[in-house]
Interface confidence: low
């Protein structure tokens, strides 16, 4: 397996204001072993894994605010370390293709 | 970034509980590549039940197998061609 | 070796579609993304959108939703690309190309086609 | 993206570079092209820094941030080509605007 933190840039959406600021944090990926199983035991589901967060922090960041609206303060995960694992459906989306990290709706992209 | 090197590719390898001299048994392993990172506010905004994170995975799966029936009767999959898909056990 | 084989050039008429295709060999079709790209004199290289034949899994470039279509067949190893609607705007070489890592739409593009001229005239 | 040079004259064994600016940070996912005058394209260098399979090692890549370049250390005829950059950090991946690369 090769999965690992890797540094990425997020998008921060400031709905109200439509504008993004973009953070550099650091997240996981890479690559993890997985098998098909030729023999389906209904008793036995197979586990396939996947790389994600084995331990996660939560930081927050100010946006700035604009026109009528103050500045706020956004609460995002970051991971600490990584691994292949199931991936916990509880708090994450389990997905084959997300709209990735650094997605803004707005044009507008704030440093 | 991570090194596609440090990991075999999902290939077609025999498993050695099922086979049988003559008659291998194949089945499809290796690495796929997947991700994790904070879930946009555009995708939260679509979820009934909203998750901070999102994990984008495929899995080492059998693009195409033969149903054989082995010694002790057992039913398995001979694997015929393996692809990096959709994964539909990795979820806890 | 891996090689992209796109169809030959098209000359068709506005408001018409067509379909252009991508004959990929020397690989696992199944396990790679595969993008196309567009490319038109003094406007650069743009991201039409990509596949990912293992699923079937499509992504698009908001610009190109409603004009490109991207399919693939897997029997055939080859991916096709419907433009529709064809306007002036449409004349252009466009490119498909597959990415880097197996599973993975992201890396961007290793392997690259010969590329296919659509002109659009009436 | 943007390249900010859109042709460039050296000659034969120059060191030559091309740069690229990101209008946000890319976290380093960023690839340069070449587009040879018959039209193909080969990828020289992706993930800011590491070079491709089978492209020649005078090619070399670097920056981080907004700010990336390749580099041509010993410039030859067959690098007669324009070289695009592309970030695969946001979607819609975009790329460069171009930089052609003539002889003096």
């Known amino acids: 397996n090769s999965c690992e933190l890797t540094n990425i840039t997020i998008a921060i959406e400031k709905e109200e204001c439509r504008f993004c600021i973009s953070i550099n944090t650091t997240w996981c990926a890479g690559y993890c072993y997985t098998r098909d199983l030729v023999y389906k035991d209904p008793a036995r589901p197979k586990i396939q894994k996947t790389c994600t967060f084995k331990e996660l922090v939560y930081e927050t960041v100010r946006v700035p605010g604009c026109a009528h609206h103050a500045d706020s303060l956004y609460t995002y995960p970051v991971a600490t370390q990584c691994h292949c694992g199931k991936c916990d459906s509880d708090s994450t989306d389990c997905t084959v293709r997300g709209l990735g990290p650094s997605y803004c709706s707005f044009g507008e992209m704030k440093e | 970034a991570p090194d596609v090197q440090d990991c075999p590719e999902c290939t077609l390898q025999e498993n050695p509980f099922f086979s049988q001299p003559g008659a291998p048994i194949l089945q499809c392993m290796g690495c796929c590549f997947s991700r994790a990172y904070p879930t946009p506010l555009r995708s939260k905004k679509t979820m009934l039940v909203q998750k901070n994170v999102t994990s984008e995975s495929t899995c080492c799966v059998a693009k195409s197998y033969n149903r054989v029936t082995v010694m002790g009767g057992f039913k398995v999959e001979n694997h015929t061609a393996c692809h990096c898909s959709t994964c539909y056990y990795h979820k806890s | 070796e891996v090689q992209l084989q796109e169809s030959g050039a098209e000359l068709v008429r506005p408001g018409t579609s067509v379909k252009i295709s991508c004959k990929a060999s020397?690989?696992?079709?199944?396990?790679?993304?595969l993008g196309w790209v567009k490319q038109r004199p003094g406007h650069g290289l743009e991201w039409i959108g990509d596949?990912?034949?293992?699923?079937?899994?499509?992504n698009y470039n908001e610009k190109f939703k409603g004009k490109a279509t991207l399919t693939a067949d897997t029997s055939s190893s080859t991916a096709y690309m419907q433009l529709s609607s064809l306007t002036s705007e449409d004349s252009a070489v466009y490119f498909c190309?597959?990415?880097?890592?197996?599973?993975?739409?992201?890396?961007?593009?290793?392997?690259w086609g010969q590329g296919t001229l659509v002109t659009v005239s009436a | 993206k943007t390249q900010t040079t859109s042709s460039l004259s050296a000659s034969l064994g120059d060191r030559v570079t091309i740069s690229c600016s990101a209008s946000?940070?890319?976290?380093?996912?960023l690839n340069w092209y070449q587009q040879k005058p018959d039209g193909t394209v080969k990828l020289l260098i992706y993930?800011?820094?590491s070079l491709h399979s089978g492209v020649p090692s005078r090619f070399s890549g670097s920056g981080s941030g907004t700010d990336y370049s390749l580099t041509i250390s010993n410039l030859e005829p067959e690098d007669i080509a324009t070289y695009y950059c592309?970030?695969?950090?946001?979607?819609?991946?975009?790329f460069g605007g171009g930089t052609k690369l003539e002889i003096k």
């Open positions: 020397g690989y696992t079709f199944t396990n790679y993304w």
């Open positions: 592309q970030q695969y950090s946001k979607l819609p991946w975009t």
């Open positions: 993930y800011t820094s």
């Open positions: 596949i990912y034949p293992g699923g079937g899994y499509t």
């Open positions: 190309a597959r990415t880097p890592l197996y599973g993975s739409s992201y890396g961007g593009f290793a392997y």
């Open positions: 946000q940070g890319i976290s380093n996912y």
